[in-house]
């Protein structure tokens, strides 16, 4: 069976939108208006691992684009890249273990733990226009909290 | 140090289930990011990646021999186990398994190997 | 599946020779490459990760290099103990796949 996915945007708690910064980073800011069309939009997909009722598999790509989010070590350090694949191979159910994050609700609000690297999180800096990074800290300056808005297809 | 030994039946016969069990000293399965591997080797012939099992209990397996193999764990006795139903002469091979971490999977420690030999 | 090609089956080369054996992947592997050293006693060893990362206790005579598809291992001053065969093993997408593998020898 195909893998399921759907088409969304993701804003931060603080309300600040993703947009792409060069051809392999995302920044978050605070976007208005006809800006808005700058925000990215992932096709979040279905994947294969652990699921219960509040934590749910999931690939994040890059709509009509070849590039998932990925986790990997770069330095010793879990680290968030865009990364390229070949479009006739993704998504796929059984994702690479690098592109994999846990989907997690919690009062409304999602978190996104890497599959890989358990407690790191899809993280934004409360600074305007920086990168979206993995972090390893909850509830501390950095944002881990998201919303997620649905886009038609 | 990180050992890795492999044990199997040696020799079995076509249509039989083939059992190998990886036993490690040195790390543990439950150490998040780890993973251990399966690597067969027919004599004379070039490596064939089979399975991986993660710390977490995520399996892979190669499409290619899926509906065949297994793969599991006991972390608690520092194993890894491979079952191959309905084997053939062609799965004669030396057997590896072998320990990485993280994906990108790079092997970083290997055991010696155990020769499977499938015949009639 | 991605194909993994050691187009170099055999090889011979002198001690002290500098030697390159190449791999290349059937589509781009984002340098998820990795190549391992087998003795002719079956013993396989890590040498290099991520296309040029040298493993602990490899010695320095190895290095990797490349990017995209073509790959390519280098011994610089080849030594009696590096007769072995070399397999390179692509990480960038599931089945991992090896190439055929290098024997190496000495002339």
């Known amino acids: 069976a195909p893998v399921r996915s759907l088409n969304c945007t993701l804003r931060d708690s603080q309300q600040k939108s993703l947009v792409m910064s060069g051809p392999y980073e995302l920044k978050a800011l605070h976007l208005q208006g006809q800006d808005m069309e700058q925000q990215v939009v992932f096709s979040m997909s279905f994947v294969q691992g652990e699921e219960s009722n509040d934590k749910i598999p999931v690939a994040l790509g890059l709509k009509e684009k070849n590039l998932y989010l990925s986790c990997v070590l770069k330095d010793d350090k879990p680290t968030l890249q865009l990364e390229s694949v070949d479009p006739k191979n993704y998504p796929k159910k059984k994702m690479e273990k690098r592109f994999v994050f846990n989907k997690i609700e919690i009062n409304n609000k999602l978190e996104f733990e890497s599959a890989q690297f358990p407690n790191w999180y899809i993280s934004t800096s409360q600074a305007e226009n920086m990168p979206v990074f993995l972090g390893g800290t909850k509830g501390g300056q950095d944002i881990t909290d998201f919303t997620m808005q649905f886009v038609s297809s | 140090q990180v050992t890795l030994k492999e044990s199997g039946p040696g020799i079995l016969k076509p249509s039989q289930t083939l059992s190998l069990t990886c036993s490690f000293s040195g790390f543990s399965l439950s150490t998040s990011g780890m993973g251990v591997g399966w690597i067969r080797q027919p004599s004379g012939k070039g490596l064939e990646w089979l399975a991986h099992?993660?710390?977490?209990?995520?399996?892979s397996y190669n499409p290619s021999l899926k509906t065949q193999l297994t793969i599991s764990k006991d972390t608690s006795r520092n194993q890894v186990f491979l079952k191959i139903t309905s084997v053939d002469t062609v799965d004669t091979a030396t057997y590896f398994c072998?320990?990485?971490?993280?994906?990108?999977?790079?092997?970083?420690?290997w055991g010696q190997g155990t020769l499977v030999t499938v015949s009639s | 599946d991605i194909q993994m090609t050691q187009t170099t089956s055999s090889l011979s080369a002198s001690l002290g020779d500098r030697v390159t054996i190449s791999c290349r992947a059937s589509q781009d592997i984002s340098n998820y490459l990795s190549w391992y050293q087998q003795k002719p006693d079956g013993t396989v060893k890590l040498l290099i990760y991520y296309t040029s990362k040298l493993h602990s206790g490899v010695p320095s005579r190895f290095s990797g290099s490349g990017s995209g598809t073509d790959y390519s291992l280098t011994i610089s001053n080849l030594e009696q103990e590096d007769i072995a065969t070399y397999f390179c093993l692509q990480g960038k997408m599931l089945p991992w796949t090896f190439g055929g593998g290098t024997k190496l020898e000495i002339k």
């Open positions: 099992i993660w710390w977490d209990g995520d399996e």
């Open positions: 072998a320990r990485n971490r993280y994906d990108p999977p790079w092997f970083v420690d």
